[in-house]
Amino acid sequence: GVFNYETETTSVIPAARLFKAFILDGDNLFPKVAPQAISSVENIEGNGGPGTIKKISFPEGFPFKYVKDRVDEVDHTNFKYNYSVIEGGPIGDTLEKISNEIKIVATPDGGSILKISNKYHTKGDHEVKAEQVKASKEMGETLLRAVESYLLAHSDAYN
């Protein structure tokens, strides 16, 4: 089955700048600003566009060693990014893949809203574990806030 979870979160960082840092340079930035959450990001194949496969490794003590993400779409004009978790982590006997969509929308106050959709593709009639969804959401929030804190302090970066 397919289970869809949608969330929204806000940032004080303008949409274009956040897209550049959080989406386009996340591979480089995440291990630097959130070493407690991401150990490394390695490009397995591709140049960042659709079809690119990345291996994200987690620090010791995490329940999972790594995940592999596949980039599905990068829309620089509308600040949209689609990717799928295709291997490692929770992917296995009961879960086929997780398709994720992130859209960053500018807000009148100069900040932005992140609209996030996570589709869990389970095998057969398996359900999605609530703690899996919660952990994924928390990881996303951790990375966003880590990037936001760095960008607030470095106004010259990612302009």
């Epitope: 630097k32 600003v33 150990s39 880590a146 936001e148 804190s149 760095y150 607030l152 302090a153």
Partner: antibody, heavy 119, light 104 residues
Framework: EVQLVQSGAEVKKPGESLNISCNGS????????IAWVRQMPGKGLEWMGI????????KYRPSFQGQVTISADKSITTAYLQWSRLKVSDTAIYYC????????????WGQGTLVTVSS | DIQMTQSPSSLSASVGDRVTITCQAS??????LNWYQQKPGKAPKLLIY???SLQSGVPSRFSGSGSGTDFTLTISSLQPEDFATYYC??????FGEGTKVEIT
């Protein structure tokens, strides 16, 4: 045990060059930013800049840009703060610190290096 | 650059007193604020990170609160070893001017 050990006190003349060091141990040195912080005599703490030893990405506070150079050698887990021409106003204690807490809090600090510049 | 303004610059208090130090950012820094304690001749020590999270090993009498532009460090019951200078700091950036806590 995480430790940052700084080089010893220095007495220099104006116009001279200087390199002070900060050696990190007990953790993966390449994975955490190192910050340099200045404290002039009787004054507060001033953020100078940071370096990420993994790829030597460096960010300076605008007022210190061009005044000092921050570098690192990950092969010997050491960060450096360098001056090409010292001024009397560079007299201060310089601390290095590891940014290991969530959102870049400085969780471990070196003992400080006193730099005295006098003619 | 975002400016950090700390107040008061100094205060006198007695053992057992409740002490409050404030820090104001010139624009919103969300909750990306750290508090440090420094004793004479020593390196600073991290007390609070992310505005309200207590650093490991720091006594629970220290607490932090606030978000956006206004932040507070509270010492619920001042102990003899707490007489020191306290600094707020925007993560990855500037420190406040410091608050010296002295014995009355």
């Amino acid at each position: 045990e995480v430790q940052l050990v700084q080089s010893g006190a220095e007495v220099k003349k104006p116009g001279e060059s200087l390199n002070i060091s900060c050696n990190g141990s007990g953790y993966n040195f390449t994975k955490y930013w190192i910050a340099w912080v200045r404290q002039m005599p009787g004054k507060g703490l001033e953020w100078m800049g940071i370096i990420y030893p993994g790829d030597s990405d460096t960010k300076y506070r605008p007022s210190f840009q061009g005044q000092v150079t921050i570098s690192a050698d990950k092969s010997i887990t050491t960060a450096y703060l360098q001056w090409s021409r010292l001024k009397v106003s560079d007299t201060a204690i310089y601390y290095c610190a590891r940014l290991g807490a969530t959102y870049g809090g400085a969780d471990y600090w070196g003992q400080g290096t006193l730099v005295t510049v006098s003619s | 650059d975002i400016q950090m303004t700390q107040s008061p610059s100094s205060l006198s208090a007695s053992v057992g007193d409740r002490v409050t130090i404030t820090c104001q950012a010139s624009q919103s820094i969300v909750n990306y604020l750290n508090w440090y304690q420094q004793k004479p001749g020593k390196a600073p020590k991290l007390l609070i990170y992310a505005a309200s999270s207590l650093q490991s090993g720091v006594p629970s009498r220290f607490s932090g609160s606030g978000s956006g532009t206004d932040f507070t460090l509270t010492i619920s019951s001042l102990q003899p070893e707490d007489f020191a200078t306290y600094y707020c700091q925007q993560s990855y950036a500037a420190f406040g001017e410091g608050t010296k806590v002295e014995i009355t």
